[in-house]
Interface confidence: low
């Protein structure tokens, strides 16, 4: 009888261990909540609604700095965890697709390509590389293609709406279409420094007969051939204080 | 009987180990999913269909490079140590929003901006940096803006109610509004030393036509554009007794 | 000085660090701007008797302890702070460091 | 500091690294472009007792805890990140590194 009792106690012990862990999860969280309030010297949790937060939270540099580059980091006094990384993912490459722009629509009434919207999180001085990728449709005969990337500007007195960014000449042979990359690091950095100057770009890739080979608004079967910007940024995680 | 019981318990132990491993596989994966979203700063998995991916995903070299030569890279690990901590949180940055002040209301009957209330816990000698941030509305034509920050004082015999803190002149171009920061470290330290002297400030940012560009009481669509104070403090934790 | 890691479903009875995520959004603490959640973790489990303990603190054994005798405790051996950005209820946003909020390692003491 | 490697069918009771593949396609996470799956692994098994402790926090044993004592745990001693290519839900594709996603080695600590 005794050995049976002992066995039951042991079995019950294993069950109790589970129950105990389950049971204490909520009380642990409650304890942590109390601890946080205490550590922040707050008697109660501030009563502030989401709407109030949206209204009060300054959309401004120091806040953006703290929130956007928010990092749950380790303090120097504690070496942190098993690996030399911060908790959050570090962004290395951003692929940005074109979006619609009112200004581009106004130019001659029909949508034009391309307007790229940027997050204020990208700092111009963190840009390592920025390339505009465009897809050129296949040609039927060997031809020379003149690629021109124009930047839209506010209309000048003489009516000028564009200024050149980059031009290049390339030879194409029949077969499949090709992807062509164009360095736009400088223009992107300027856009990031002066967002209001980013009104969009126009892409032209004319063959010898004046046909535009650039895919700007993909037609049937042209999914995934939109122009896009590939931006490589440096976001070296500092072994920072958490 | 006892040995049979013991054998059953051992068998059950082996079964439990298997069950446990099977059982936890899904919950481990759930935990990893939650962890990935958290590490990518995503609240939920982006809701994007296979079709949308096919349309959006550029069929292009940089993407192909990343996918085809895809590499799950390893980092060397480093480990951690203990931390010398006090019980309470150490504050590094304080963002203070303006509140209403009876004195400011009395000045000419309508509310004026701005009164900043400070906690007596901020010690004047711990202030490393104090900046007043103000948002200046966009201008339509290039203009010079005269920014003036005045400190309210108890009315003097000659009726003076203000004394200058800081003035600056800046050039603004059409486009978006701008955030301007003004160093107010000295005045803040004085307020902390003599709280009764903190009666509020007045902010003016006049363009060449005398229009005030400073957002002091945000209008529609101006959420988050209130002036605010950014105070950086040094709060070296003492190893206190708990 | 190493510490074990378990999960909630572990059959391990000895001192272990268990995952515990504190999700501020889940209990409506919108006043915490960042982080929205963090991994706090906790220690739990059994310890063998230790005769020479590093710290002389009394080990509290709860009334339901079936053995009734005191022994060493499963406790954090390494902790770290978190940085937090929050509204303090006085029209202020604070960015500060809260010490000892994450259990990095558990051990017996 | 080396660790044991086991598989799901292993009878090894000591601390061991077990394989665990996370297959993003299997649970419909199409927004992750690459990798489509990766080996996360996990640690499980028994450890010998560790006696010395570093931290003075007293562990209060809950009334339902049947034992009230503790020991060391089988935990990752080396972890590594994975690189990931993914849609972030804002018309952008991100290529980045996610830390501590792969268990490379398990040990007792």
């Amino acid at each position: 009888e005794n050995s049976e009792q002992k066995e039951n106690v042991e079995k019950e012990g294993l069950c109790n261990a589970c129950t105990w862990r389950q049971n204490t999860k909520s009380s642990r969280i409650e304890a942590i909540k109390i601890q946080i309030l205490s550590k922040l010297r707050l008697e109660t949790a501030p009563n502030i609604s989401k709407d109030a937060i949206r209204q009060l939270l300054p959309k401004a540099p120091p806040l953006r700095e703290l929130i956007d580059q928010y990092d749950v980091q380790r303090d120097d006094s504690s070496d942190g965890s098993l690996e030399d990384d911060d908790y959050h993912a570090t962004t290395e490459t951003i692929i940005t697709m074109p979006t619609e722009s009112d200004f581009l629509m106004q130019v001659d009434g029909k949508p034009k390509c391309c307007f790229f919207k940027f997050s204020s999180k990208i700092q111009y001085n963190k840009v390592v590389k920025a390339q505009l990728w465009i897809y050129l449709r296949p040609v039927e005969t060997p031809t020379t293609v003149f690629v021109q990337i124009l930047r839209l500007i506010k209309p000048m007195k003489d009516g000028t709406r564009y200024t050149g960014i980059r031009s290049l000449k390339l030879d194409m042979n029949p077969g499949t279409g090709i992807w062509q990359s164009i360095d736009v690091k400088t223009v992107l950095q300027n856009w990031l420094k002066q967002p209001e100057s980013n009104l969009g770009i126009e892409i032209k890739a004319l063959d010898e007969n004046g046909h535009d080979l650039a895919v700007t608004f993909p037609g049937p079967g042209e999914d995934g051939l939109n122009p896009f910007l590939e931006v490589k940024v440096t976001d070296t995680p500092k072994r920072s204080r958490r | 009987e006892n040995s049979e019981q013991k054998e059953n318990v051992e068998k059950e132990g082996l079964c439990n180990a298997c069950t446990w491993r099977q059982n936890t596989k899904s919950s481990r994966i759930e935990a990893i999913k939650i962890q990935i979203l958290s590490k990518l700063r995503l609240e939920t998995a982006p809701n994007i269909s296979k079709d949308a991916i096919r349309q959006l995903l550029p069929k292009a070299p940089p993407l192909r490079e990343l996918i085809d030569q895809y590499d799950v890279q390893r980092d060397d690990s480093s480990d951690g140590s203990l931390e010398d901590d006090d019980y309470h949180a150490t504050t590094e940055t304080i963002i203070t929003m303006p509140t209403e002040s009876d004195f400011l209301m009395q000045v000419d009957g309508k509310p004026k901006c701005c009164f900043f209330k400070f906690s007596s816990k901020i010690q004047y000698n711990k202030v490393v940096k104090a900046q007043l941030w103000i948002y200046l509305r966009p201008v339509e034509t290039p203009t010079t803006v005269f920014v003036q920050i005045l400190r309210l004082i108890k009315p003097m015999k000659d009726g003076t109610r203000y004394t200058g803190i800081r003035s600056l002149k800046l050039d603004m171009n059409p486009g978006t509004g701008i955030w301007q920061s003004i160093d107010v470290k000295t005045v803040l330290q004085n307020w902390l030393k003599q709280p009764e002297s903190n009666l509020g400030i007045e902010i003016k940012a006049l363009d060449e036509n005398g229009h005030d560009l400073a957002v002091t009481f945000p209008g529609p669509g101006e959420d988050g554009l209130n002036p605010f104070l950014e105070v950086k403090v040094t709060d070296t934790p003492k190893r206190s007794r708990r | 000085d190493f510490g074990l890691d378990c999960d909630e479903h572990s059959t391990e009875s000895r001192c272990c660090r268990y995952p515990l995520t504190v999700d501020f959004e889940a209990f409506g603490w919108d006043w915490i701007i960042a982080p929205k959640r963090y991994k706090a973790n906790y220690c739990s489990g059994e310890c063998e008797f230790v005769f020479l303990q590093k710290y002389p603190h009394t080990h509290l054994v709860h009334q339901a302890n079936p053995r009734g005798s005191a022994g060493p405790c499963c406790t954090p051996t390494k902790m770290s702070p978190i940085n937090m950005l929050y509204f303090n209820g006085k029209e202020q946003i604070i960015y500060g460091k809260i010490p000892a909020m994450v259990v990095d390692r558990c051990g017996c003491s | 500091d080396f660790g044991l490697d086991c598989d799901e069918h292993s009878t090894e009771s000591r601390c061991c690294r077990y394989p665990l593949t996370v297959d993003f396609e299997a649970f419909g996470w199409d927004w992750i472009i690459a990798p489509k799956r990766y080996k996360a692994n996990y640690c499980s098994g028994e450890c010998e007792f560790v006696f010395l402790q570093k931290y003075p926090h007293t562990h209060l044993v809950h009334q339902a805890n049947p034992r009230g004592s503790a020991g060391p745990c089988c935990t990752p001693t080396k972890m590594s990140p994975i690189n990931m290519l993914y849609f972030n839900g804002k018309e952008q594709i991100i290529y980045g590194k996610i830390p501590a996603m792969v268990v490379d080695r398990c040990g007792c600590s």
């Epitope: 389950q22 999860k25 909520s26 989401k50 | 899904s26 919950s27 759930e30 | 909630e8 | -």
Partner: antibody, heavy 119, light 110 residues
Framework: QVTLKESGPVLVKPTETLTLTCTVS????????ISWVRQAPGKGLEWVGI???????YYASWAKGRLTISKDTSKNQVVLTMTNMDPVDTATYYC?????????????WGQGTLVTVSS | DIVMTQSPATLSLSPGERATLSCTSS????????LSWFQQKPGQPPKLLIY???TLAYGVPSRFSGSGSGTDFTLTISSLQPEDAATYYC??????????FGQGTKVEIK
């Protein structure tokens, strides 16, 4: 005092649309999930749907396509709309604070309102 | 669809006896512990007893306790009192906004 109170028609004809309102006091709907649960006479509880504090909605599989839950935070009201009512939908409809399976959700309920579907 | 099965359908015990109510889910509840127990008396709304499978809700007598994980859960009333006569429901959460109730166990006091 924290309360929830359901209100709406007591009688609905088949094929008609039911609209019930849950009025709360002492609860900030921008911080709190609200659930709807129903109970047919002499039967068990049946989960209907939830509106989260953020405004996301989740519906029971049987209710999808027929059910809409919305809220007006400023009025402290949550509204349940169920189309194409059928006699089998005759039940007492309850609104509850939180999610009755997560954390301490379901710690507070309204008294319920009996809705009869009959021609 | 998720099915939550409660057993027995009816339990008839004397005051002071131990009541054990079972709840089995056709699939694991989220995080293995998204399970609550409710008590309902005729003409009243349900009352929360237990959440997170085993945590006693505020103001609930300690004779009520919950246990279990994953798919199998138990509500125990250690010493039945006359006022415990009621129908008891389990409710499970499954992630992705999916929730379900059991069909209930009626507890009668002899």
């Amino acid at each position: 005092q924290v309360t929830l109170k359901e209100s709406g028609p007591v009688l609905v004809k088949p094929t008609e649309t039911l609209t019930l309102t849950c009025t709360v006091s002492g609860i900030d709907l921008s911080h709190t999930d609200i659930s709807w649960v129903r109970q047919a006479p002499g039967k068990g509880l049946e989960w209907v749907g939830i509106i989260s504090y953020a405004g996301s909605t989740y519906y029971a599989s049987w209710a999808k396509g027929r059910l809409t839950i919305s809220k007006d935070t400023s009025k402290n009201q949550v509204v349940l709309t169920m189309t194409n009512m059928d006699p089998v939908d005759t039940a007492t409809y309850y609104c509850a604070r939180g999610v009755p399976a997560y954390s301490h959700g379901g710690d507070l309920w309204g008294q319920g309102t009996l809705v009869t579907v009959s021609s | 669809d998720i099915v939550m099965t409660q057993s027995p359908a009816t339990l008839s015990l004397s005051p002071g006896e131990r009541a054990t109510l079972s709840c089995t889910s056709s699939q694991s509840v989220y995080h293995n512990n998204w399970l609550s127990w409710f008590q309902q008396k005729p003409g009243q709304p349900p009352k929360l007893l237990i959440y997170w499978a085993s945590t006693l809700a505020y103001g609930v007598p300690s004779r009520f306790s919950g246990s279990g994980s994953g798919t199998d859960f138990t509500l125990t009333i250690s010493s039945l009192q006359p006022e415990d006569a009621a129908t008891y429901y389990c409710a499970g959460g499954y992630g992705g906004g999916r929730y379900a109730f059991g069909q209930g166990t009626k507890v009668e006091i002899k």
